[in-house]
Amino acid sequence: MAVTACQGLGFVVSLIGIAGIIAATCMDQWSTQDLYNNPVTAVFNYQGLWRSCVRESSGFTECRGYFTLLGLPAMLQAVRALMIVGIVLGAIGLLVSIFALKCIRIGSMEDSAKANMTLTSGIMFIVSGLCAIAGVSVFANMLVTNFWMSTANMYTGMGGMVQTVQTRYTFGAALFVGWVAGGLTLIGGVMMCIACRGLAPEETNYKAVSYHASGHSVAYKPGGFKASTGFGSNTKNKKIYDGGARTEDEVQSYPSKHDYV
């Protein structure tokens, strides 16, 4: 039961995470104009991975896409790549994890297959989450660097009578969405990996070993191993990962919870 819950929860958390990664990637507010020097600006700038926007106090918003590929900063391209890789891995992970869910029966799929699929999806979710976190962090670092550079420029070159105020950008909502979503996907992946351990059936089924004592035959089963329970054609010897006694549910599955955001 605990394995099923862990796997299911891992799937749901990863799903939320991946949805968040997609949302963050599509959002326009990766960087927003810093309003420290002018909190009542009539023009508000914000930028995303794909376009930049200007919101006027009149109510009009104009967005323009980055129609050049070669003219964009390498860092921005890298962030785009990381986020897309995260999305793709997460999407594949979701697809795999759906079939790996213990509560879903597909033909005569064995527990070992489900365990492998759960582990695969968990790893995909972990990598997906890491990609998202890395992408957002690279962008944040870029913002911090540019912020202090523009601050330095703002206070130099003010010798003339005319002031040219340089627009500085700070963290936008998309960064926080991306960090949280990446974290959720990562956690979901870890949960899926944990669930995989619970799902994996025993490798070795020790047959009852007869010990002749007092002239009686007594079947002795060591505590760390489990005899075949008669589910399916359990002819292979399967080793249980955890030495402790478990319910059938616990042995069968652990929910994995790593989803891409």
Partner: antibody
Framework: QVTLRESGPALVKPTQTLTLTCTAS????????MSWVRQPPGKALEWVAT????????YYNPSLKDRFTISRDISANQLVLKVTNMDPADTATYFC???????????WGQGTTVTVSS | DIQMTQSPSTLSASVGDRVTITCKSS????????????LTWYQQKPGKAPKLLIY???TRESGVPSRFSGSGSGTAFTLTISSLQPDDFATYYC?????????FGGGTKVEIK
């Protein structure tokens, strides 16, 4: 077509409160920022206040102290300006205007002249 | 606050003349986000409400004759009337639409020579 019509008292005594109303028609009132601009006799235009489309944000001319309050009633398509503690220096023609692209004021009312005198 | 300075304050011209009015701002009105200058030009006739001529420093409002054109960037802007018509005798104002408080220039009165 877009029309803006200001209304309010023509004569106000000093220290009294002035309430001006601008009734809009011909456009989606809640989609545009609205402004009040005034012009003392023989002088230049002076921006007074602006309110955002939904009414969430208000902006005021800091040189006019805190006596001005701009608000809007979206259901009635009305823009309101309240000025407390009126002073003879507030004598002017008050215009309401719609903000458009570039924050430019593309439509203006005909203006209402307010005289502050005892 | 951004100060707007217009010159000249009064301009005498004849019908058919090319007229240029300048407007200077104490800070740049160029927005880096869309590379547009938030400067607006208005025309006002005595006893009437102002009329929008040009926004974004150079974009002509619909219905405004093509003889009116705006140019400039950053802190220096000009309004040009290529061939002055009798209907163009009025007062012209520039306005900062980039930063609150929105500020108007002192105005340039174009009168008949």
């Amino acid at each position: 077509q877009v029309t803006l019509r200001e209304s309010g008292p023509a004569l106000v005594k000093p220290t009294q409160t002035l309430t001006l109303t601008c009734t809009a028609s011909g456009f989606t009132f809640s989609s545009y920022g609205m402004s009040w601009v005034r012009q003392p006799p023989g002088k230049a235009l002076e921006w007074v206040a602006t309110i955002s489309g939904g009414g969430s944000y208000t902006y005021y001319n800091p040189s006019l102290k805190d006596r001005f309050t701009i608000s809007r009633d979206i259901s009635a398509n009305q823009l309101v300006l309240k000025v407390t503690n009126m002073d003879p220096a507030d004598t002017a023609t008050y215009f309401c205007a719609r903000q458009s692209r570039g924050n430019a004021m593309d439509y203006w009312g005909q203006g209402t002249t307010v005289t502050v005198s005892s | 606050d951004i100060q707007m300075t217009q010159s000249p304050s009064t301009l005498s011209a004849s019908v058919g003349d090319r007229v240029t009015i300048t407007c200077k701002s104490s800070q740049s009105l160029l927005n880096s986000g869309n590379q547009k200058n938030y400067l607006t030009w208005y025309q006002q006739k005595p006893g009437k409400a102002p009329k929008l001529l040009i926004y974004w420093a150079s974009t002509r409002e619909s219905g405004v004759p093509s003889r009116f054109s705006g140019s400039g960037s950053g802190t220096a802007f000009t309004l040009t009337i290529s061939s002055l018509q009798p209907d163009d005798f009025a007062t012209y104002y520039c306005q900062n639409d980039y930063s609150y408080p929105l500020t108007f220039g002192g105005g340039t009165k174009v009168e008949i020579k």
